[in-house]
Interface confidence: low
Amino acid sequence: FERTRSLQDPCSNCPAGTFCDNNRNQICSPCPPNSFSSAGGQRTCDICRQCKGVFRTRKECSSTSNAECDCTPGFHCLGAGCSMCEQDCKQGQELTKKGCKDCCFGTFNDQKRGICRPWTNCSLDGKSVLVNGTKERDVVCGPSPADLSPGASSVTPPAPAREPGHSPQ
């Protein structure tokens, strides 16, 4: 029965960019301005997203696809489809309710977003601090003092920085 009904449903013939207009004998009408339908057979068109305030238009709305927003300079996207914009901070800072604040001693943030994280504790791995940490950079761990005897292998270079956007939020 479902299959028979769908075959007879005139709305199923309405393509994306149109809607099945019940007020006009179920004929396919184009989506009105500032609305869209991304799939066929829809009985209504969805209102286009408006990018306003801190949001900028990255892609205009069309009859078949919604607008896409990104954030104005000084802010970055959060959430699916850039549903929120969050203020950037400088490296060495984190965002708090009172705006961007410097990382406390013993913590760092090497990105414009995210939170300050504790410096690596080199001694947990039996290593020593080769380069001191800063608000912007983690410490660099070197070999333990015992490894620094003549003939010991050279210091392993630090791992490459993490990809942007992968710090815990």
Epitope: G53, V54, L78, M84, C85, L95, K97
Partner: nanobody, 122 residues
Framework: EVQLVESGGGLVKPGGSLRLSCAAS????????MSWFRQAPGKGLEWVSY????????DYADSVKGRFTISRDNAKNSLYLQMNSLRAEDTAVYYC???????????????WGQGTLVTVSS
Amino acid sequence: EVQLVESGGGLVKPGGSLRLSCAASGFTFSDYYMSWFRQAPGKGLEWVSYISGSGDIIDYADSVKGRFTISRDNAKNSLYLQMNSLRAEDTAVYYCAREDSRLTGTTDFDNWGQGTLVTVSS
């Protein structure tokens, strides 16, 4: 639908005053922190001030502290920004925004007004 409409902007001389208003609708106004932001010509957006839902928690950017006063009237669903001792560097489009996060500058996409222009010039 959330709607925020700013008004009260205009041209004012340095040292002058303006009062901005933001009329809110489509949500329970008293439940939300509200903020003012501004964007000077060719610059990024800057947070100006916020106020908690009940009005008991308030903070200001250092650049406006002592000159600007944020307030709200929950009975009228309105947010205000009283701006005194205005300077040329206060020239900007001012936006009110509903905050859905405890972090300044993190706001839901729809919760912004269209802005009102404040020009401070002699």
